[in-house]
Every structure is written in structure tokens, then in C-alpha cells.
């Protein structure tokens, strides 16, 4: 049977270093807020990821931008309330030498 | 200033348990091939990820599907050649109790 095989160039293009959506824990970005809970507890951010086709290179952000999001902060013994939190997103990624 | 703030419902929707593209090392899926190199060394696969809004739940695949990709296999002292490798992708995700 003719199984649909993803051709090499497409596999390469989708695997190569780029900014991809990643779910990041809020408290990992705001460690000082560890005693509070947020809803959602993770947010979707663009992060550089992927392979560079050379083990001496790695995928790094060369341009970032801030994004501000509205989350619910759960304060103990109080009703949840909206807060605004700002996160850094990766806008442009490049393969750069590991020891840079 | 009216800065564009991502509203709560959109933040929630984008963070909630779903199948998201993730770059996965080929050898982590094919550990028996650890002595060979592949190009690309990672592939883009759909994987369940995200928060469930309840710490007793986690995001798990409830439906998977195979995808076959064409990669270059680099054999030591030989020219690279195309191979077909099959990976499991997550198609549908759900929040399920941790102890299930």
C-alpha cells in the first residue's frame, strides 16, 4: 500500500531551528510568585528550538519581544483576580556556534 | 497606553491540553540506532502538552497515529542514504486523572 511518506526536504524544513510554540510554566518565568497559583499554570510562548545540522551549532534567539497576558491569580482565601504578566518570546532564531 | 494584552480566555485556550508540534530527537525514538547519525537529528511530531486547570489531572494522548518520514542515515565510512522511519504522533489529547 502507498503509505504517505513525508519527503526529506519537508522533514528537514520542519525540524530546522525556528521559533515554535511551547508551553511554559508561569512560575518558571516568575519564580518570586511561587507561593501563588495562576490559572492557567502554563502559557504558550514562542521559543527557539530545532536542529542545526551540525553538532557544533545550536539554535538560539537573535531577536525577542515581550508579550503581556491576562491570567487569574489565585490568592489564598480570596476570590481569583486578573493580573497582567509579561513574558519574553523568541521572534527570530539562528544556528550559532556552541561556544559563543 | 492601550498595549495589546492577550485576554484571559485566549491565554487559557492556547495553554489548555492539546497536541502541539514538538521537536523530538530521532535517537530518543529509535534508541537501538544510537551508533548511527541521522539528518535531521530531530523531527517535528505532534505531542500532547499543556495544563489541565487541576493539579490532579494531566494531559495525555487518547488517540495516536503513525507518521512515516524520509531521513538521511549517515553510516560511518559510507555515503548517506535515505531511510524511512515511522514515529507515533498524538492526534487527540484529554485531561485525565494522574492515577489512572
Amino acid at each position: 500500500s502507498e503509505v504517505e511518506v513525508v519527503p526529506f526536504q519537508e522533514v528537514w524544513g520542519r525540524s530546522y531551528c525556528r521559533a515554535l510554540e511551547r508551553l511554559v510554566d508561569v512560575v518558571s518565568e516568575y519564580p518570586s510568585e511561587v507561593e501563588h497559583m495562576f490559572s492557567p499554570s502554563c502559557v504558550s510562548l514562542l521559543r527557539c528550538t530545532g536542529c542545526c545540522g551540525d553538532e557544533n551549532l545550536h539554535c538560539v534567539p537573535v531577536e525577542t519581544a515581550n508579550v503581556t497576558m491576562q491570567l487569574l491569580k489565585i490568592r489564598s482565601g480570596d476570590r481569583p483576580s486578573y493580573v497582567e504578566l509579561t513574558f519574553s518570546q523568541h521572534v527570530r532564531c539562528e544556528c550559532r556556534p556552541l561556544r559563543e | 497606553s492601550e498595549v495589546e494584552v492577550v485576554p484571559f480566555q485566549e491565554v487559557w485556550g492556547r495553554s489548555y491540553c492539546r497536541a502541539l508540534e514538538r521537536l523530538v530527537d530521532v535517537v530518543s525514538e529509535y534508541p537501538s540506532e544510537v551508533e548511527h547519525m541521522f539528518s535531521p537529528s530531530c523531527v517535528s511530531l505532534l505531542r500532547c502538552t499543556g495544563c489541565c486547570g487541576d493539579e490532579n489531572l494531566h494531559c495525555v494522548p487518547v488517540e495516536t497515529a503513525n507518521v512515516t518520514m524520509q531521513l538521511l542515515k549517515i553510516r560511518s565510512g559510507d555515503r548517506p542514504s535515505y531511510v524511512e522511519l515511522t514515529f507515533s504522533q498524538h492526534v487527540r489529547c484529554e485531561c485525565r486523572p494522574l492515577r489512572e
Epitope: 490559572s39 483576580s81 497582567e84 | 480566555q9 485531561c95
Partner: antibody, heavy 116, light 112 residues
């Protein structure tokens, strides 16, 4: 305890502008949204907009864009709403309200009368 | 924009009577992942500022008497006062916070 103290009643002429203040106390001002709500005679409540004192970011009800301008002074924990090009339609009681998505603490209201 | 339709516009009841008022939304206010509806009820007594009674459609605000009960999910919501007291004379508003904020037109409660 949490309090929102609003400025006193205003009688202004059509075409003029007015700035209403709302002084917050009893909590960390920068941690909670301040919303503004209109109650016109014989009408229901209408949300005008919000300001987040932690960032100064604002969001307006489309209906009040160009009419209301929300600002803050974090040093005095005070929120302000300026209303411009006033007409008789702007005659109402205006409330500042803490928090979102649920409005837990309300100011006492400021009566604005627009009349020649 | 989300529109909230309250009914009835007004009602007059005897002391001790049970009363229900409704709020219908033009779209669902339910965040299914959270299993919560973004709807609140407020009470505004004559000459006073509004007061939060119920949030998440059914959670009673601290200090609110238990004769006040909120119910419903999605698009249809109800506020029930199990035994009306003289001090309950007020206008009752529902408010959605799913997308920005809109209030219903209010239900005026009077005593016969």
C-alpha cells in the same frame, strides 16, 4: 480595609471636560485592576473601561473610546477618569471599581450633571 | 458583543416568599476546561453602590446571606432568594466577564 474614595459631585457645561478621581487604600494598588462603570438616570450599569495600575495598560468599551481617558498616579494610589466633549447624555453617576473578573469593591460614586 | 437579557424587568413579592430571576446570555459564558461560567450577580440598593453577591455563576461572596443562590451554566442563569426580606429591595444585575464586561438591564425587586 479596602476603600475607594471618589471625588465629589460635578456640575459642568456642555462641551467641557471633567476629571473624576478615585483614591484607593487598604491594599496594594498595583496588584488589582481599576474599572469604571456608568449608571445613567433610568438606565442600567455600563462598563466604561479598565486600567491595570501595575502596567498602566488600558482597555475601553468601544462605546466610550474618545469619550473617556483612564490614567493612574501610583505614588498616590489614585485612578482618574477624564470625560471630554460633555453632553447631557453623560449625566450619570460614575463608579470606580476594584478587581476583575468580579467587581468586589466599589467607590461611593460621583454624580456628574451636564447642564447649561 | 455579548448581550445579557434579564427577566422579569420587575417583580413585587410578599415578605418570606421565594423569588427567582433569570439572565440569558447571547453566547456561552462557560470555560469548559475550568468548568466555570464567567457570570456574576450584583445587588444595588436605592442610593447605594452595587454589591457583589455571586460569582462563577454559583459561588456566594463572603458575607452574603445563604438565602441568595446562583445557578445555571453556559447561557442560562438564575438568581434565587429563598425567603425575601425587606432589606432585599434592590435592583439585581447579572454581569458577564467572559469577554470584557457587560451587564444585564437589571431586575427590580419590590415588596407588596
Amino acid at each position: 480595609q479596602v476603600q475607594l474614595q471618589q471625588s465629589g459631585a460635578e456640575l459642568v457645561k456642555p462641551g467641557a471636560s471633567v476629571k473624576i478621581s478615585c483614591k484607593a487604600s487598604g491594599y496594594t494598588f498595583t496588584d488589582y485592576y481599576i474599572n469604571w462603570v456608568k449608571l445613567a438616570p433610568g438606565q442600567g450599569l455600563e462598563w466604561i473601561g479598565w486600567i491595570y495600575p501595575g502596567s498602566g495598560n488600558t482597555k475601553y468599551n468601544e462605546k466610550f473610546k474618545g469619550k473617556a481617558t483612564l490614567t493612574i498616579d501610583t505614588s498616590s494610589s489614585t485612578a482618574y477618569m477624564q470625560l471630554s466633549s460633555l453632553t447631557s447624555e453623560d449625566t450619570a453617576v460614575y463608579f470606580c471599581v476594584r478587581d476583575s473578573p468580579f467587581f468586589d469593591y466599589w467607590g461611593q460614586g460621583t454624580l456628574l450633571t451636564v447642564s447649561s | 458583543d455579548i448581550v445579557l437579557t434579564q427577566s422579569p424587568d420587575s417583580l413585587a413579592v410578599s415578605l418570606g416568599e421565594r423569588v427567582t430571576m433569570n439572565c440569558k446570555s447571547s453566547q456561552s459564558l462557560l470555560n469548559s476546561g475550568m468548568r466555570k461560567s464567567f457570570l456574576a450577580w450584583y445587588q444595588q440598593k436605592p442610593g447605594q453602590s452595587p454589591k457583589l453577591l455571586i460569582y462563577w455563576a454559583s459561588t456566594r461572596e463572603s458575607g452574603v446571606p445563604d438565602r441568595f443562590t446562583g445557578s445555571g451554566s453556559g447561557t442560562d442563569f438564575t438568581l434565587t432568594i429563598s425567603s425575601v426580606q425587606a432589606e432585599d429591595v434592590a435592583v439585581y444585575y447579572c454581569k458577564q466577564s467572559y469577554h470584557l464586561f457587560t451587564f444585564g438591564s437589571g431586575t427590580k425587586l419590590e415588596i407588596k
